[in-house]
């Protein structure tokens, strides 16, 4: 039975506003999957825990993804 092809991305809109690292609680990286064809970056802000979707094409996020994959390759068994 083929898997459902319904697109279920978490991010409805993407913020192109730069994020100040001091105001970040955490960043979650959700890789592309059969449910959502694009990588999603969800920033949780320190104030009120507000969540914001960041543009994976921005220079900062590309740098971040590069750093994460570098870490991943270092730590993978």
């Amino acid at each position: 039975v083929p898997l459902s092809r319904t697109v279920r991305c978490t991010c409805i809109s993407i913020s192109n506003q730069p994020v100040n690292p001091r105001s970040l609680e955490k960043l979650e990286i959700i890789p592309a999957s059969q449910f959502c064809p694009r990588v999603e970056i969800i920033a949780t802000m320190k104030k009120k825990g507000e969540k914001r979707c960041l543009n994976p094409e921005s220079k900062a996020i590309k740098n971040l993804l590069k750093a994460v994959s570098k870490e991943r390759s270092k730590r993978s068994p």
């Epitope: 730069p18 994020v19 100040n20 690292p21 001091r22 970040l24 609680e25 955490k26 960043l27 979650e28 990286i29 959700i30 890789p31 999957s33 220079k59 900062a60 740098n63 971040l64 750093a67 994460v68 570098k70 870490e71 991943r72 730590r75 993978s76």
Partner: antibody, heavy 134, light 110 residues
Framework: QVQLVQSGAEVKKPGSSVTVSCKAS????????ITWLRQAPGQGLEWMGE????????NYAQKFQGRVTISADESTSTAYMELSGLTSEDTAMYYC???????????????????????????WGQGTTVTVSS | QSVLTQPPSASGTPGQRVTISCSGS????????VNWYQRLPGAAPQLLIY???QRPSGIPDRFSGSKSGTSGSLVISGLQSEDEADYYC???????????FGGGTKLTVL
């Protein structure tokens, strides 16, 4: 082990500008923040501002706003601090230091998390003396 | 005038225990962590304590830190002559949106 090496001593005239550089080695430059501080003779430590190269965003101390510019060049792993409108009160030892560090958790799961931990300035440059004199 | 308040000087004899206080407000120490730095003569500062009470590797356990409300404390037990230095407390200030320091405490080992 991360090391920070700063540029050499500077002697400047009042009203001019100075640029101090801070070159990082032994770590991923973009995955931490660089802070700039100074210590004037007989005074305490003073925070001037910081930059996170990965995000390209700088925060400045209110006191220096409009007079200081902090930048970073990822290709050379170097941070810069430019201070303009110098007066004799800017005569001080200037330091760069590593502050916030990116930590990745749940790395081998399908949803890695990144946090930035500001655990204090744990690596310092050797300091650059800036003397402002006519 | 420093945002955080420290005594300008402290002293003790070898083997003694010395406490250095650091007083702030709700916008800095009250809502953020305290760090302590040691500055030996002619050297760059060194991180002694982070996150109120954590020691970086290589820092002897004679140094300890604590935080209560809007104040922090650094305790040096078993004082040694090489501990003679300037000590600075620091925190982040949410109102000023920047790192703030105490004026420093000059520790003399008698």
């Amino acid at each position: 082990q991360v090391q920070l090496v700063q540029s050499g001593a500077e002697v400047k005239k009042p009203g001019s500008s100075v640029t101090v550089s801070c070159k990082a080695s032994g770590g991923t430059f973009s995955s931490f923040s660089i802070t700039w501080l100074r210590q004037a003779p007989g005074q305490g430590l003073e925070w001037m501002g910081e930059i996170t190269p990965m995000f390209g965003i700088a925060n400045y101390a209110q006191k220096f706003q409009g007079r200081v510019t902090i930048s970073a060049d990822e290709s050379t792993s170097t941070a810069y601090m430019e201070l303009s409108g110098l007066t004799s009160e800017d005569t001080a030892m200037y330091y760069c230091a590593r502050d916030g560090r990116f930590d990745v958790s749940d790395l081998l799961t399908d949803k890695p998390k990144v946090t930035i931990n500001y655990n204090g300035m744990d690596v310092w440059g050797q300091g650059t003396t800036v003397t402002v004199s006519s | 005038q420093s945002v955080l308040t420290q005594p300008p000087s402290a002293s003790g004899t070898p083997g003694q225990r010395v406490t250095i206080s650091c007083s702030g407000s709700s916008s800095n120490i009250g809502s953020n962590t305290v760090n302590w730095y040691q500055r030996l003569p002619g050297a760059a500062p060194q991180l002694l304590i982070y996150n109120n009470d954590q020691r970086p590797s290589g820092i002897p356990d004679r140094f300890s830190g604590s935080k209560s409300g809007t104040s922090g404390s650094l305790v040096i037990s078993g004082l040694q002559s090489e501990d003679e230095a300037d000590y600075y407390c620091a925190s982040w200030d949410d109102s000023l949106n920047g790192r703030v320091f105490g004026g420093g405490t000059k520790l003399t080992v008698l």
